[in-house]
C-alpha cells in the first residue's frame, strides 16, 4: 500500500490507476476507515450522504473535500480499462494536524541551587497524532531522571475535535556554583515524520545560591549516647537560625511519628530504643537540613561508658532531603 499523509481539514485526491480518463468506467472504490464498519463500496454513480465525505470524480479519482481523523484507514480502487485489463490501487491514509506554537506557562523567575525546583509547564494544543514534548537546557536536550531532572507529562484529547493537548512539567535541581542564568526551552515533535519540531520562546530564570546554613548541632546527654537499661537519654537539636525552624526526629533514617520539637527525650531506655538518631530542621527559606547522626546504645552492667556508644555519622548537610 502507498502511504499518504493528509492535513486535517484539507482536501485529498486519490488516483484510481488504470481507470479510463472519462466515463463510462468500470471501477469501484472500497474504504475501510473510522467512518465505516468493515468495507464501504463507492461507485462513480455516487449519491447519498457519503458525497459530503468522499465522492468519485469523473476521472475515477476519489475526492475527500476535508479530511478528518475518521478518514484514516485503507482506500482501494479496482478499475478495468477498455481492453478488460484490471488494475488495483491501494492507499494507506494517515492524517495529521500541526499544533500552535508550544508555550511555557507558570515559569519560574528564580530557581534555588541544590534543591528541586519547578521550571515551568510546556503546553502544546491541537496536535494529531499526539506527538511529544521535550525540554532543552542551553540548546541541549534534557534527559529525564538524569542529574536532578524530572518531567511530569500529561496528554489530553479534546472530546469533539479528537486533537491532543500535551503538557510537560519540568523539575530541575540546579548544581551549586553552576550557570546563574540557564536557558530553558521546550519543543514539540510531531508524531508523523517529515515535519520539523516547533520550539517555544526560551526562558532564563535566575539561580539563587542559598548561603550555607550554620550546622545543626545534635547534643546528646549522657555524652557518648551510652546508657544503662531504664536510664534516660535527652537529645537536643541546636539550630542557630532565626526564626526557629521546625525540628523533626529520625531513628535509623525513618521519621518518628512525633510533633515538631527541639528536644527528644527517651525516658526509659530499652533494647528497642537503640539505634541511630538525627534531627531535621526545616526552614521556610532554606528547606530541610539534617544533623549528624548519634548512636544510642545500652551499657550492660560492667561495661565502660562512652566506648559503648559512638557519636558520629554522615554530616549530610543541607541537601540531605533534597
Amino acid at each position: 500500500a502507498q502511504n499518504i499523509t493528509a492535513r486535517i481539514g484539507e482536501p485529498l485526491v486519490l488516483k484510481c490507476k488504470g481507470a479510463p480518463k472519462k466515463p463510462p468506467q468500470r471501477l469501484e472504490w472500497k474504504l475501510n476507515t473510522g467512518r465505516t464498519e468493515a468495507w464501504k463500496v463507492l461507485s462513480p454513480q455516487g449519491g447519498g450522504p457519503w458525497d459530503s465525505v468522499a465522492r468519485v470524480l469523473p476521472n475515477g479519482s476519489l475526492f475527500l473535500p476535508a479530511v478528518g481523523i475518521q478518514d484514516e484507514g485503507i482506500f482501494r480502487c479496482q478499475a478495468m480499462n477498455r481492453n478488460g485489463k484490471e488494475t488495483k490501487s491501494n492507499y494507506r491514509v494517515r492524517v495529521y494536524q500541526i499544533p500552535g506554537k508550544p508555550e511555557i506557562v507558570d515559569s519560574a523567575s528564580e530557581l534555588t541551587a541544590g534543591v528541586p525546583n519547578k521550571v515551568g509547564t510546556c503546553v502544546s494544543e491541537g496536535s494529531y497524532p499526539a506527538g511529544t514534548l521535550s525540554w532543552h537546557l542551553d540548546g541541549k536536550p534534557l534527559v529525564p531522571n538524569e542529574k536532578g531532572v524530572s518531567v511530569k507529562e500529561q496528554t489530553r484529547r479534546h472530546p469533539e475535535t479528537g486533537l491532543f493537548t500535551l503538557q510537560s512539567e519540568l523539575m530541575v535541581t540546579p548544581a551549586r556554583g553552576g550557570d546563574p542564568r540557564p536557558t530553558f526551552s521546550c519543543s514539540f515533535s510531531p508524531g508523523l515524520p517529515r515535519h520539523r519540531a516547533l520550539r517555544t520562546a526560551p526562558i532564563q530564570p535566575r539561580v539563587w545560591e542559598p548561603v550555607p546554613l550554620e550546622e545543626v548541632q545534635l547534643v546528646v546527654e549522657p555524652e557518648g549516647g551510652a546508657v544503662a537499661p531504664g536510664g534516660t537519654v535527652t537529645l537536643t537539636c541546636e539550630v542557630p537560625a532565626q526564626p526557629s525552624p521546625q525540628i523533626h526526629w529520625m531513628k535509623d533514617g525513618v521519621p518518628l511519628p512525633l510533633p515538631p520539637s527541639p528536644v527528644l527525650i527517651l525516658p526509659e531506655i530499652g533494647p528497642q530504643d537503640q539505634g541511630t538518631y538525627s534531627c531535621v530542621a526545616t526552614h521556610s527559606s532554606h528547606g530541610p537540613q539534617e544533623s549528624r547522626a548519634v548512636s544510642i546504645s545500652i551499657i550492660e552492667p560492667g561495661e565502660e561508658g562512652p566506648t559503648a556508644g559512638s557519636v558520629g555519622g554522615s554530616g549530610l548537610g543541607t541537601l540531605a532531603l533534597a
Epitope: 526526629w249 518518628l256 512525633l258 510533633p259 515538631p260 520539637s261 527541639p262 527517651l266 525516658p267 526509659e268
Partner: nanobody, 124 residues
Amino acid sequence: AVQLVESGGGSVEAGGSLRLSCAAAGIAFSSYILAWFRQAPGKERELVSASWRGDSTYYLPSVKGRFTISRDNAKNMVYLQMNDLKPEDTAVYICAAKEFPRWLTLSPLDYDHWGQGTQVTVSS
C-alpha cells in the same frame, strides 16, 4: 475522668519565689509523665519542666537551676518550686499529664490531659 487542678499562682516581685501544686485524679499517677507548661500572652505554650519515674526530670534551659520539679506519688501531686523569679517568667502555668511514652518531646501536642492553669505575675 482525668482531672488536673493547679494552685499556688500569684504575684511576686523579681527575685521572689512561688510554689505551684498540681493535684491529679483519675490517672495511674506513677505511670504518667507530669509536666508544667507555661503560656505568656501572644506566645506559644512551652514546656518548663517534666518529671517521670523516680527522680528523672527535664528543665527548660532558661529555668534550670532556678526551678525544681518534684512529685509525690502517694498523694498524686506534682510541684514546681520557682526561685529567683524574673519578669520574663510571667505566664499562665499549666499542669499536663501523659501516659508513660517511649519518646517524649517538648510539644504540647504530645500531652493528653491538661489543667486550667494558674497565673504567675512577676513584676520588676
